[in-house]
């Protein structure tokens, strides 16, 4: 079956700059600013555009070793990134895949709001665990905060 979910979190970083750093250069930046969460990101197929397959490897001691993600859309005009987790991580016996859309919208205060929509494709009658969703959301927010801290400390980067 399918379970739809969404969450949002604010950022002090303007939308264009956050999209550039967090999304467009996330493969390089995340292992650098959050090595405790992401060891490496490699393109195993494609050049970053739709259809690209990425492998994200997690550090020793993490609950999962890796995930494979398929890039479905990169919208540089509307600051929207759509990707599907197709292997590894929570994908397995109960979960077929997770489709994720990250949209960064401008906030009135000059910062931005990160909107994350998830579509969980479960196998059979498996239910999505609310705790699992909470953990995934917290991980995403943690990565965002790490990128935010880096950008605040490096005001010349990603402008």
């Amino acid at each position: 079956g399918v379970f739809n979910y969404e969450a949002e979190t604010p950022s002090v970083i303007p939308a264009a700059r956050l999209f550039k750093a967090f999304i467009l250069d996330g493969d390089k930046l995340l292992p650098k600013v959050a090595p405790e969460a992401v060891s490496s990101v490699e393109n195993i197929e494609g050049n970053g555009g739709p259809g690209t397959i990425k492998k994200i490897t997690f550090p020793e001691g993490s609950p999962f070793k890796y995930v494979k993600e398929r890039v479905d859309e990169v919208d540089r005009v509307n600051f929207k990134y759509s990707f599907s987790v197709i292997e590894g991580g929570a994908v397995g016996d109960a979960l077929e895949k997770v489709c994720n859309e990250i949209k960064i919208v401008a906030a009135p205060d000059g910062g931005s709001i990160l909107k994350i929509s998830n579509k969980f494709h479960t196998k059979g009658d498996h239910e999505i665990n609310a705790e699992q969703i909470k953990i995934e959301k917290e991980k995403a927010v943690g990565l965002l905060k790490a990128v935010e801290s880096y950008l605040l400390a490096h005001s010349d980067a990603y402008n």
Epitope: G1, V2, F3, N4, S82, C99, S117, K119
Partner: antibody, heavy 122, light 108 residues
Framework: QVQLVESGGGVVQPGRSLRLSCAAS????????IHWVRQAPGKGLEWVAV????????YYGDSVKGRFTISRDNSKTMVYLHMNSLRTEDTAVYYC???????????????WGQGTLVTVSS | EIVLTQSPGTLPLSPGERATLSCRAS???????LAWYQQKPDQAPRLLIY???SRATGIPDRFSGSESGTDFTLTISRLEPEDFAVYYC?????????FGQGTKVEIK
């Protein structure tokens, strides 16, 4: 403007098959999931099936699972509902409906076709 | 599956009056993932509200949606002659996507 036009309905005997078509125009078809929703005479709405923007993901209501198959042709901007082993309780107006949100879809329906009537009777 | 129960089944009102339609969910509707549709005889349904309270494109502001826990409400502030129809709620948080049985707003 967005248009969805269903065709293929008619009278069919129980156990037989029918294929419904939905021709779409007025929007970027390949970016949207498409659903089929039906309405038995004098009754409420029942969701039947959905197909994702790329055709990879297909889901069905319990009452049609294993008998109906949804498919799409993005080059022709068409969606199809192949209905096998039809039962009298499948008698309904069948609507195709566009998902209200692009790419992965949110599973609400912002545009509907006018519907096509399927009557299953011996 | 999530069961939606609409009440009342029929709502007899006069033009100019306020209509309050209810939709109760059997379980929590995360993210306010509930839509309202209007259907007139021999016509396809039309989307009025999504996300429990967001009006769809071209929908007059006399239509509004609200929620409180698992209870959702569609309000038509001042009924126009063209508003007499059947109204359905629909959840889109968890498949299968389900509809309420409908509320008919009829002329008193």
């Amino acid at each position: 403007q967005v248009q969805l036009v269903e065709s293929g309905g008619g009278v069919v005997q129980p156990g037989r098959s029918l294929r419904l078509s939905c021709a779409a125009s007025g929007f970027t078809f390949s970016r949207y999931a498409i659903h089929w929703v039906r309405q038995a005479p004098g009754k409420g709405l029942e969701w039947v099936a959905v197909i994702s923007y790329d055709g990879d993901d297909k889901y069905y209501g319990d009452s049609v699972k294993g008998r109906f198959t949804i498919s799409r042709d993005n080059s022709k901007t068409m969606v199809y509902l192949h209905m096998n082993s039809l039962r009298t309780e499948d008698t309904a107006v069948y609507y195709c409906a566009k998902d209200g949100y692009s790419l992965y879809g949110k599973d609400y329906f912002d545009y509907w076709g006018q519907g096509t009537l399927v009557t299953v009777s011996s | 599956e999530i069961v939606l129960t609409q009440s009342p089944g029929t709502l007899p009102l006069s033009p100019g009056e306020r209509a309050t339609l209810s939709c109760r969910a059997s379980q929590s509707i995360t993210n306010s993932y509930l839509a309202w549709y209007q259907q007139k005889p021999d016509q396809a349904p039309r989307l009025l509200i999504y996300g429990a309270s967001s009006r769809a494109t071209g929908i007059p502001d006399r239509f509004s949606g609200s929620e409180s826990g698992t209870d959702f409400t569609l309000t038509i502030s001042r009924l126009e002659p063209e508003d007499f129809a059947v109204y359905y709620c629909q959840q889109y948080v968890r498949s299968p996507w389900t509809f309420g049985q409908g509320t008919k707003v009829e002329i008193k």
